[in-house]
């Protein structure tokens, strides 16, 4: 799994005019991290886990950061020519990522109501557009404002590139929280099903980092992947993360399978509670 | 219709620079897309060098090290590959092509380094 | 860089048979930054599938293109005889853009 971080700005507009505050929240390696708060116009970490990442330093660079994001995305906003009256929303999201290899990955992608309409690859200043027509005249007529200056552009998308990378290794290499191992707690549970049968259930939770292996075994031997259900590995809001596997199996034969977990080296199997 | 077409001297002595151009027609490589070079020596695969964007921003590759240059002439509509302290290993067919999958692609000029 | 590594490297086959050709990447690569290109000899490479599975302009039907993350697939479903040529894998997610070393399909 790469680190990555994550940036989620929204700014709108009614009938035409663009609104001055902007909704903003970043996640680092797929966790909440910070959001911006708009009554105090600051950066603030979104719980413990995000306080601990960066210690006693303050969040004035988030804050500057994310105040002058919110400034560009409003004015890209403004130049959306095909505004009608009501409510409308223009998102950008901007990933990027370091993965084991060390090479890195930077992507923003713009929204509009809701619908994808624009996509960069930052580092190699690709732009995709999805099919529809109204995505192709959105993009077209972003990409114009962000062409009007050149220079101006690509020095800020560079710098973006550049700035994000540069924030995820300062997290990484400040913080102890992101180079920390907490092995997961395994809970198996079991449900009455259909005559005769039973559905197991496997549960980890309270893990990180995220990756994780979890699969059910009979006789020691695992189970082919079209016969198990797989939860996804979802933030639990404290820093760590959960997931699940359930599988269903006649009553009787219970002690012949067994949860197997691996995580960060080490690997436990648990039985199905009789 | 988009046409790419390379050129530049076949020959380069060792140690010399190597330089080509590539005239693009049918589109204006200042619109959009990565403009790149990329070579194929005798028998073998497919290495890029680099590209300059319609931004004119440059990308090079890093085994390259820092021989390779790419630059654009806007007003001809063109852009160019220097390769300097040249060796026989850079013998090969150099194309330039649009894009980042390469949908255009020119003819390719072969390049011999020999004294 | 991501190193892209293509199997097999020759493959041979007659016409009317179905060929499949593999790439595997070192890292992971997002899909709509993944092609496939066919190069007969004396001639430049020409684009063949872009975006995983996409077909360039005025390629025939009986090409396909699929995968995903490090692991990405080329399928001709009945040979042709033009089709036996060269393929190249080639990803554009980070630079250096990289190909993989080529499959050489030939007639058996």
């Known amino acids: 799994e790469p680190h990555s971080l994550r940036y989620n700005l929204t700014v709108l507009s009614w009938d035409g005019s663009v609104q001055s505050g902007f909704l903003a929240e970043v996640h680092l390696d797929g966790q909440p991290f910070l959001r911006y708060d708009r009554q105090k116009c600051r950066a603030k970490p979104q719980g413990q886990w995000a306080e601990d990442v960066l210690g006693n330093k303050t969040w004035d660079r988030e804050t500057r950061d994310l105040t002058g994001n919110g400034k560009d995305l409003r004015m890209t906003l403004a130049h959306i020519k095909d505004q009608k009256e009501g409510l409308h929303s223009l998102q950008e999201i901007r990933v990027c990522e370091i993965h084991e290899d060390n090479s890195t990955r930077s992507s923003q992608h713009f929204y509009y109501d809701g619908e994808l309409f624009l996509s960069q690859n930052v580092e190699t200043e690709e732009w995709t557009v999805p099919q529809s027509s109204r995505a192709q005249t959105l993009a077209m007529n972003v990409r114009n404002f962000l062409k009007e200056d050149a220079m101006k552009t690509k020095t800020h998308y560079h710098a973006m590139h550049a700035d994000c990378l540069q924030e995820l290794r300062r997290y990484l290499e400040s913080s102890v929280v992101l180079r920390r191992r907490v092995p997961p707690m395994v809970n198996v549970t079991r449900s009455e099903a259909s005559e005769g049968n039973i559905t197991v259930t496997c549960r980890a939770s309270s893990f990180y980092p995220r990756n994780i292996t979890l699969t059910w075994r009979q006789d020691g031997v695992s189970l082919s992947h079209d016969t198990q259900q797989w939860g996804d590995v979802l933030p639990d809001g404290n820093g760590t993360y959960q997931t699940w596997v359930a599988t269903r199996i006649c009553q009787g034969e219970e002690q012949r399978f067994t949860c197997y977990m691996e995580h960060s080296g080490n690997h436990s199997t648990h039985p199905v509670p009789s | 219709q988009v046409q790419l077409q390379e050129s530049g001297p076949g020959l380069v002595k060792p140690s010399e620079t190597l330089s080509l151009t590539c005239t693009v027609s049918?589109?204006?490589?200042?619109?959009?897309?990565?403009w790149n070079w990329i070579r194929q020596p005798p028998g073998k695969g497919l290495e890029w060098m680099g590209f300059?964007?319609?931004?004119?921003?440059?990308k090079y590759n890093p085994s390259l090290k820092s021989r390779v240059t790419i630059s654009r002439d806007t007003s001809k509509n063109q852009f160019s590959l220097k390769l300097s302290s040249v060796t026989a290993a850079d013998t090969a067919v150099y194309y330039c092509?649009?894009?980042?999958?390469?949908?255009?692609w020119g003819q390719g000029t072969t390049v011999t380094v020999s004294s | 860089e991501i190193v892209l590594t293509q199997s097999p490297a020759t493959l041979s086959l007659s016409p009317g048979e179905r060929a499949t050709l593999s790439c595997s990447a070192t890292?992971?690569?997002?899909?709509?930054?993944f092609h496939w290109y066919q190069q007969k000899p004396g001639q430049a490479p020409r684009l063949l599938i872009y975006r995983t599975s996409n077909l360039a302009s005025g390629i025939p039907a009986r090409f396909s293109g699929s995968g995903s993350g490090t692991s990405y697939t080329l399928t001709i479903s009945s040979l042709e005889p033009e089709d036996f040529a060269v393929y190249y894998c080639?990803?554009?997610?980070?630079?250096?853009?990289?190909f993989g070393q080529g499959t050489k399909l030939e007639i058996k």
């Open positions: 092509a649009r894009g980042y999958g390469f949908d255009y």
């Open positions: 890292s992971s690569i997002s899909s709509i930054y």
């Open positions: 300059v964007s319609y931004s004119g921003t440059t």
């Open positions: 049918g589109y204006s490589i200042t619109s959009d897309y990565a």
């Open positions: 080639q990803q554009g997610t980070t630079i250096p853009f990289t």
